[in-house]
Amino acid sequence: SWMWNQFFLLEEYTGSDYQYVGKLHSDQDRGDGSLKYILSGDGAGDLFIINENTGDIQATKRLDREEKPVYILRAQAINRRTGRPVEPESEFIIKIHDINDNEPIFTKEVYTATVPEMSDVGTFVVQVTATDADDPTYGNSAKVVYSILQGQPYFSVESETGIIKTALLNMDRENREQYQVVIQAKDMGGQMGGLSGTTTVNITLTDVNDNPPRFPQSTYQFKTPESSPPGTPIGRIKASDADVGENAEIEYSITDGEGLDMFDVITDQETQEGIITVKKLLDFEKKKVYTLKVEASNPYVEPRFLYLGPFKDSATVRIVVEDVDEPPVFSKLAYILQIREDAQINTTIGSVTAQDPDAARNPVKYSVDRHTDMDRIFNIDSGNGSIFTSKLLDRETLLWHNITVIATEINNPKQSSRVPLYIKVLDVNDNAPEFAEFYETFVCEKAKADQLIQTLHAVDKDDPYSGHQFSFSLAPEAASGSNFTIQDNKDNTAGILTRKNGYNRHEMSTYLLPVVISDNDYPVQSSTGTVTVRVCACDHHGNMQSCHAEALIHPTGLSTGA
């Protein structure tokens, strides 16, 4: 049987001779050279050679455990004479023994990390890691310990874990933002003779909101003309904040002062400036100077820094309103007036008033813009603004008159303003009802009494547009001895009825019926309309067959004896 255990070989042998590994030996070997030892497997004949007579194995090259820690070979012992094995082929191991020949290497040459400024001592920043290629299972060659070479007293590193933490209270980004920390990793548990490696950690303090906004000056002054419309920017103010990003964002607001309702402040998001704008119309004559208290504040505040004081600042803004020569101002934006359509010429409808808003209080004169009143229906007293009629009105022609009145400063005619006047013409019952159409009808010669031959309808131009109450009757001059009667249907219609049995067209071919139509409005209006009734020959169904055409062609000589 074979007589060996596993072989151990120290790595990185630096001797001049081959490094002795060990000896293969069979108990069949009598030392007479009859056995031959053969080596095969990992590195056999190259890395490892064997004396075929003695079984001594030697390493021909310097070995590196970190490259290959174990070699597996096979041993044979054969009888030189017969060539037969005297032992079964057997596998054996050569284990490379570690020495501390590798320094720790960090996973990154340079680390970058951030940590909020003003963090508590011991706040985690980053973890660095170094690895050592030596054998961790044997000795301390691979036992790494971390230490800080550069970066104290600001940061510390945990020796076992490589965790870097803050080590100093109140580190202020606004004082210093960047730190370069050098960390060493040393093997042999940090003992003397251990190998080491280093890495650089670039640490940036990130901003927190630990600084309030501050106005660079306590008072600002701006000027604006009184004519500035709402929304006009009149000046910019800027507070500075040592922080950055959203921690440096500023919101401006007006917190006090007589101009609280008159001005606004808006924040320019790009420049972080406060823009003072006009909110309401200014009037130099009412107020010439306004003061505002403007506050700049951080919208995002960290409660833990509130002990540092309020995260806002205020400044006084003085706004001087400049005088502008203004046109007259009417007491209303528009005037709505009413007048009855039966108003006589020179009837006063109402009046307008305008005043020069300037301190000078220049007198004004009034006029009607004739482009809006081409027919000169209305006029105005240039001195007191009274509007009066200069022509008769008719609601049925025009219900609304829309005119423009101009007020002009007498001393400065360039300064003028205009106002619309809407004049409603109120209805008066000044139109009589009349027939809705021209009525020309016929009656059959053989008609019976009380037969309906025509229904009459009426219209009235006055109000109400619908809902009139009309009455119909024969005119007094035709009422007695009439051949026809009017039946008022009480629904704004009336019927013409025959009053006798039979009509003779040769005796009387056409009747003219005067009908009086009246409304029941005030004052009552009435008109007389004439209905033409022709006498015609009809068939037994009452359909007209023939009438005297001459009755239509020659109206002279027609009887009105209806």
Epitope: R340, L426, Q469, S473, D521, V524
Partner: antibody, heavy 116, light 107 residues
Framework: QVQLLESGGGLVQPGGSLRLSCAAS????????MSWVRQAPGKGLEWVSV????????YYADSVKGRFTISRDNSKNTLYLQMNSLRAEDTAVYYC?????????WGQGTLVTVSS | DIQMTQSPSSLSASVGDRVTITCRAS??????LNWYQQKPGKAPKLLIY???TLQSGVPSRFSGSGSGTDFTLTISSLQPEDFATYYC?????????FGQGTKVEIK
């Protein structure tokens, strides 16, 4: 059916004021002229005032002109008569009536007595 | 103002009688005349408008005629419910005026 109902009458001292109302129903109130007619105790009828359908025009008897004001609220179907500076001769039953020329419907009347 | 004069001021009649009341205007009023009936403690009621047009719901025994200045109200056959005071009214021109009334009593 057409109904007119007056209210607001009563005893008032000379120089005093009173406001009569007339609630209308059963017809399109806004389409009709409306009138007030009065009747002194044991006397005949006297036309007092009329207002057109839209309320745009009003007319008065000379005896009440400047003292009485007729008005209407078409949204409430109501006619009014505001009577100021009342005199003893204004004592009467006041009727509201539909129409501007002939009065086809009348209310039951409300008595106004002017007396010290 | 136009004066309206009714005659007679009062009359006594029996049921079934034909009754005629006249109304005269101080100037021509064409056909713009109305007739009203009033019973004690009640509101007036329109009988006839435009001189001769019968108001809806009014019995046909009532009729009106005339134009200009002279007008007539006729009750062809007097009924018990017709005993009342009758008024004429012109609406030709403002102010509209009433006659002094005609009282029809039972004989």
């Amino acid at each position: 059916q057409v109904q007119l109902l007056e209210s607001g009458g009563g005893l008032v001292q000379p120089g005093g004021s009173l406001r009569l109302s007339c609630a209308a129903s059963g017809f399109t109130f806004s389409s009709y002229a409306m009138s007030w007619v009065r009747q002194a105790p044991g006397k005949g009828l006297e036309w007092v005032s009329v207002i057109r359908s839209s309320g745009s025009s009003t007319y008065y008897a000379d005896s009440v002109k400047g003292r009485f004001t007729i008005s209407r609220d078409n949204s409430k179907n109501t006619l009014y008569l505001q009577m100021n500076s009342l005199r003893a001769e204004d004592t009467a039953v006041y009727y509201c009536a539909r129409g501007g020329g002939y009065f086809d419907y009348w209310g039951q009347g409300t008595l106004v007595t002017v007396s010290s | 103002d136009i004066q309206m004069t009714q005659s007679p001021s009062s009359l006594s009649a029996s049921v079934g009688d034909r009754v005629t009341i006249t109304c005269r205007a101080s100037q021509s009023i064409s056909l713009w005349l109305n007739w009203y009936q009033q019973k004690p403690g009640k509101a007036p009621k329109l009988l006839i408008y435009a001189a001769s047009t019968l108001q809806s719901g009014v019995p046909s025994r009532f009729s009106g005629s005339g134009s200009g200045t002279d007008f007539t109200l006729t009750i062809s056959s007097l009924q018990p419910e017709d005993f009342a005071t009758y008024y004429c009214q012109q609406y030709y021109t403002s102010p509209y005026t009433f006659g002094q009334g005609t009282k029809v009593e039972i004989k």
